[in-house]
Interface confidence: low
């Protein structure tokens, strides 16, 4: 099973060697967006319906305080990066903590300058990894030298960072409406004419959780080969659930031979191609 994870993504910007005020931030819980930072209001806010419903006001107060502190840290760090030329530059920090099935934990943070990774840190061992490129080496040296000057950046500080992250993760996983619920997909099948005699049939699954799903076209009950089907990515839809699609091209008039097969969390179903109109089939909800 995938570990439970909490991930924060922060970014600060500089324009012509001047670090801009404020920062950008978002948070993901178990891969789902749950937090965004509102730069205008200078507040952390829920992202997605489930985060709004589940996590109380205190969450956003705490997150606002923590993100503000992290954002200030990141801005200070950007001012110490020496190779800044004119133009727009970005410094990004991605911080992750995980709880695995065996109760073991992991924690790391990764720094990117102008989108390029230059430093990774293990928050539990405090070990750093720097990519081979000379630019990454220079950036990492600048940053770590600055941190050494900063009395706050002790080993205790990194351990506390990891402990805070894990504490939040555990709290969020226990907050009321469970995130790891099962929500069956809504499936709809649509047809569109491509060329004379051929149509493309698309099977869309939406609003499902967890992420794992099987969606495939069948002809006379037999799955079509991979190379005759086109799949979309399984993407978050912003509501704590996912969406995806699969499409294939078939001969007009043969629609009744084709079905879309869906399997999700032990439930499965087949959905026929509509005759002349869009067909929407909604599975029974569990929540």
């Amino acid at each position: 099973a995938e570990p439970h994870s909490l991930r924060y993504n922060l970014m600060v910007l500089s324009q012509d060697e001047s670090v801009q005020s404020g920062f950008l931030a978002e948070g993901h819980l178990d891969g789902q967006p749950f937090l965004r930072y509102d730069r205008q209001k200078r507040r952390a806010k829920p992202q997605g319906q489930w985060a709004e419903d589940v996590l109380g006001a205190k969450t956003w107060d705490t997150e606002t305080e923590d993100l503000t502190e992290n954002g200030q840290d990141l801005r200070r760090t950007l001012t110490h990066i020496k190779d800044q030329k004119g133009g727009l530059h970005s410094l990004q920090e991605i911080r992750v903590c995980e709880i695995h099935e065996d109760s073991s934990t992991r924690g790391s943070r990764h720094f990117y300058y102008d989108g390029e990774l230059f430093l990774s840190q293990n928050l539990e061992t405090q070990e750093s990894t720097v990519p081979q490129s000379s630019r990454a080496q220079t950036l990492a040296m600048n940053v770590t030298n600055f941190w050494k000057e900063d009395a706050m950046k002790t080993k205790t500080h990194y351990r506390a960072m990891q402990a805070d992250c894990l504490q939040k993760l555990q709290r969020y996983l226990k907050s009321g409406v469970a995130i790891r619920r099962t929500v069956p997909p809504m499936v709809n099948v649509t047809c569109s004419e491509v060329s004379e005699g051929n149509i493309t049939v698309t099977c869309r699954a939406s609003s499902f959780y967890p992420r794992n799903i099987t969606l495939t076209w069948r002809q006379d009950g037999v799955s079509l080969s991979h190379n005759t089907q086109q799949w979309g990515d399984v993407l978050p839809d912003g509501n704590g659930t996912y969406q995806t699609w699969v499409a294939t091209r078939i001969r007009q008039g043969e629609e009744q031979r084709f079905t879309c097969y869906m399997e999700h969390s032990g439930n499965h179903g087949t959905h026929p191609v509509p005759s002349g109109k869009v067909l929407v089939l909604q599975s029974q909800r569990t929540d």
Epitope: E52, D53, G56, A57, K174, S175, G176, A178, D287
Partner: antibody, heavy 117, light 107 residues
Framework: QVQLVESGGDVVQPGRSLRLSCAAS????????IHWVRQAPGKGLEWVAV????????YYADSVKGRFIISRDNSKNTLYLQMNSLRAEDTAVYYC??????????WGQGTMVTVSS | AIQLTQSPSSLSASVGDRVTITCRAS??????LAWYQQKPGKVPKSLIY???SLESGVPSRFSGSGSGTDFTLTISSLQPEDFATYYC?????????FGQGTRLEIK
Amino acid sequence: QVQLVESGGDVVQPGRSLRLSCAASGFTFSNYNIHWVRQAPGKGLEWVAVIRYDGINKYYADSVKGRFIISRDNSKNTLYLQMNSLRAEDTAVYYCASGPPDAFNIWGQGTMVTVSS
Amino acid sequence: AIQLTQSPSSLSASVGDRVTITCRASQGISSALAWYQQKPGKVPKSLIYDASSLESGVPSRFSGSGSGTDFTLTISSLQPEDFATYYCQQFNSYPITFGQGTRLEIK
């Protein structure tokens, strides 16, 4: 001290309306989701509705959906339950309750609603 | 909606007894379960949250366990003030639901 105080309970005829209030004190009301829970005479507890701390989201039990409306006024530290189309089976003591997301550790003393012709 | 079934519905016990009440959920609810005590004419009181965490001020003779679908409330040594009705409640998904209650009486 932390307190929730309900009011507005009364004897009403079936089909009529009633509005309950719940006044909060001793804690930051605007930080908490608040719920209504009811208990019919001699029966168990039944959750009725919840409103999010800022009033944006509301959920209802199936038994009251479409008839009851939960609302709050954070400036007045007050929660409301507007009960329309009342039925005999709505007869109960109505409690407002709150606390952390995973338990109700603040309860009001309850207000009695009797629906009878 | 998730159904919670408590057993037994009522039970008689003596002071000093160890008592166990169970609560079964119709589907998995992780550890999103609370236990309450209610005495006649009184307001419910929170005992346990998150299936096993003791609410502050609650005596340590009360304990909760379980996760998923099966949960237990245990009173290690019954005291006279423990005779009451006990309810479990799930917070895993809306609508929030309560068990039907377990009435604990003096034998």
